[in-house]
């Protein structure tokens, strides 16, 4: 017989199955091209001196063999005498150590026993009820498959799993999803319902992130507020990178974790947009407002846990930048304008109260007035800053108020609301003798002193009731006592105190009468 043909003679060894545990197994036969076929098998046991014979019986009952020698794979053509269009039965007989070992038989039609392709092209990955679902287009002309997957993590070896039978134009597989580690998957297919069909190669790796993206471990710092009223947010520590299985290292689409920065500007709640999401690599400039900053990690399955920080407001104040004039119609604020067409946000809140009680007002875009100032006015009826208490005022500016990262701080300062001149009048003025020609005048601190930078000075007025002469004595805003000297005994005096702001003269306190008694010598 020619080696390329199936030999229709008795094989050159006795026909007896030893029944031993070793021997040939896992016979697979399939078409590999238009006119060529291949059978391959495994051999269990010592391989020295083993000869393999591929046996074939046709539907007519005639049988033949191919001698494979020590090889466990054999190819033949459709001209080799094996009927490829009709059902044949194949098995392997291995002659070793004077005995024959037989594999299990496979019965098939060779012409349509095809070695399948693995999933090709795009494998779509999604999450379904806590499991991983993979889906792909069935390779052309290869509907009907058994599908297996194997998967590994960075620290574990391959584990095998079964996707079950597939019989459609698209195939899918449910696989385990790890909570906290990335996985590499590969898939393979073989013809369904065909005895002895062979597995395809493994597919290209499919890299899958953990269900929960890693929590970002980052730290921020915020620079000092610059002259432009902005401060830079900087990242002190980069997020840790996800550990990947071997086949996913380098280019691993699917396992990417994206980190985004979510800014929430807490100040100026009347502006149009309070939050903005940015890429973590693009660190923004912020105004001096208070912010909450969150870093959100997400992968193809969605967002994970986020980490949140609070950036407190910059409380550096500009005591002189804001002018406030109170008229009969209402109050107007003036401050140095930033540029043309600026929108300003004026925010105020009573000092010592929760930031949640801040009130604000947004101006229409405005240009500087001839003096280069920007203004904001309100009527008494509006009730804005109407109570006689200390308010903390911050003014923010933006040429693009809809863009959260383009706000800047113009100024922060304190203002005493309501009728400040009356409310600030010092109370409890008392006079005590100090010496033969002097007295000490004391008073309770003005309410204005609770407002940093508002109280410019106290003025103490002393009036000689005889001569009607008046003297005024300025006193530092931090002091609540002054000594009046050069007084004459037996003369009646009145003393009054007032508290002045930079733009408002205060109201005098009630006159306090006193005199220095004449000392009579014995």
């Amino acid at each position: 017989c020619r080696t390329s043909e199936c030999c229709f003679q008795d094989p050159p060894y006795p026909d007896a199955d030893s029944g031993s545990a070793s021997g040939p197994r896992d016979l697979r036969c399939y078409r590999i091209s238009s006119d060529r076929y291949e059978c391959s098998w495994q051999y269990e046991g010592p391989t020295a001196g083993v000869s393999h014979f591929l046996r074939c019986c046709l539907s007519s009952g005639r049988c033949c063999y191919f001698a494979a020698g020590s090889a466990t794979r054999l190819q033949f053509s459709d001209q080799a005498g094996v009927s490829v269009l009709y059902t044949v039965t194949l098995w392997v007989e291995s002659w070793a150590r004077n005995q024959t070992e037989k594999s299990p038989e496979v019965t098939l039609q060779l012409y349509n026993s095809v070695k399948y392709e693995p999933p090709l092209g795009d494998i779509k990955v999604s999450k379904l009820a806590g499991q991983l679902r993979m889906e792909w287009e069935t390779p052309d002309n290869q509907v009907g498959a058994e599908v297996q997957f194997r998967h590994r993590t960075p620290s574990s070896p391959w584990k095998l799993g079964d996707c079950g039978p597939q019989d459609d134009d698209t195939e899918s597989c449910l696989c385990p999803l790890e909570m906290n580690v990335a996985q590499e998957f590969q898939l393979r297919r073989r013809q369904l319902g065909s005895q002895g069909s062979s597995w395809s190669k493994w597919s290209s790796p499919v890299c899958v992130p953990p269900e929960n993206p890693p929590q970002p471990q980052v730290r921020f710092s915020v620079e000092q507020l610059g002259q432009d009223g902005r401060r830079r947010l900087t990242l002190k520590e980069q997020p840790t990178q996800l550990e990947l299985p071997e086949g996913c290292q380098g280019l691993a689409p699917g396992t990417e974790v994206t980190y985004r920065l979510q800014l929430h500007m807490l100040s100026c709640p009347c502006k149009a947009k309070a939050t903005r999401t940015l890429h973590l690599g693009k660190m923004p400039y912020l105004s001096g407002a208070a912010y909450n900053v969150a870093v959100i990690s997400s992968n193809q399955f969605g967002p994970g846990l986020n980490q949140t920080w609070h950036i407190p407001a910059d409380t550096h104040t500009e005591p002189v930048a804001l002018n406030i004039s109170v008229g009969t119609n209402g109050t107007t604020m003036y401050w140095p304008a930033r540029a043309q067409s600026m929108t300003y946000c004026i925010e105020w809140q009573p000092v010592g109260q929760d930031g949640g009680l801040a009130t604000c007002s947004l101006t229409a875009p405005q240009d500087p007035d001839p003096a280069g100032m920007a203004t904001y006015s309100w009527s008494r009826e509006s009730g804005a800053m109407g109570q006689e208490k200390c308010y903390y005022i911050t003014i923010f500016a933006s040429a693009h108020p809809e863009k959260l990262t383009l706000w800047s701080t113009v100024l922060s300062t304190y203002h005493f609301g309501g009728n400040a001149s009356a409310a600030g009048t010092p109370h409890h003025v008392s006079v005590k003798n100090h010496s033969l020609d002097s007295v000490s005048v004391d008073w309770a601190p003005s309410l204005l002193s609770t407002c940093p930078g508002v109280l410019k000075e106290y003025v103490v007025r002393c009036r000689d009731e005889d001569s009607k002469q008046v003297s005024e004595h300025p006193v530092q805003p931090t002091e609540t006592q002054v000594t009046l000297s050069g007084l004459r005994a037996g003369v009646a005096y009145t003393v009054q105190v007032r508290a002045d702001t930079a733009w408002l003269r205060g109201v005098w306190s009630q006159p306090q009468r006193f005199s220095i008694e004449v000392q009579v010598s014995d």
Partner: nanobody, 115 residues
Framework: EVQLVESGGGLVQPGGSLRLSCKAS????????MDWHRQVPGKQRELVAA???????NYADSVKGRFTISRDNAENTVYLQMNNLKPEDTAVYYC?????????WGQGTQVTVSS
């Protein structure tokens, strides 16, 4: 589900030609194997020609060199070109499709070769 409709059968003289068509109701990209079988009354169906995996062709020894199987993916159709017909080619010709583990058959078309 795949419906198959054959056409092109008829009466032809020995030595003549016929072209059979088998139109599938869905894309033949999803069909693993398409083949033509024939049956003479009282006998078993015989596989005549097959096209596997979209490209690989096989023929029964009795028709090799005379019959050609081909497919038109755009038309979802498989053809059997039969030349140099002989009286023993007279039979009902059936189109068959294997999609996964499912088998689909057409209703058949009669071919008669007679002078």
């Amino acid at each position: 589900e795949v419906q198959l409709v054959e056409s092109g059968g008829g009466l032809v003289q020995p030595g003549g030609s016929l072209r059979l068509s088998c139109k599938a109701s869905r894309s033949i990209f999803s069909i693993n194997t398409m083949d033509w079988h024939r049956q003479v009354p009282g006998k078993q169906r015989e596989l005549v020609a097959a096209i596997v995996n979209g490209v690989w062709k096989n023929y029964a020894d009795s028709v090799k060199g005379r019959f050609t199987i081909s497919r038109d993916n755009a038309e979802n159709t498989v053809y059997l070109q039969m030349n140099n017909l002989k009286p023993e080619d007279t039979a009902v010709y059936y189109c068959h499709a294997k999609r996964g583990v499912s088998d689909y058959w057409g209703q058949g078309t009669q071919v008669t070769v007679s002078s």
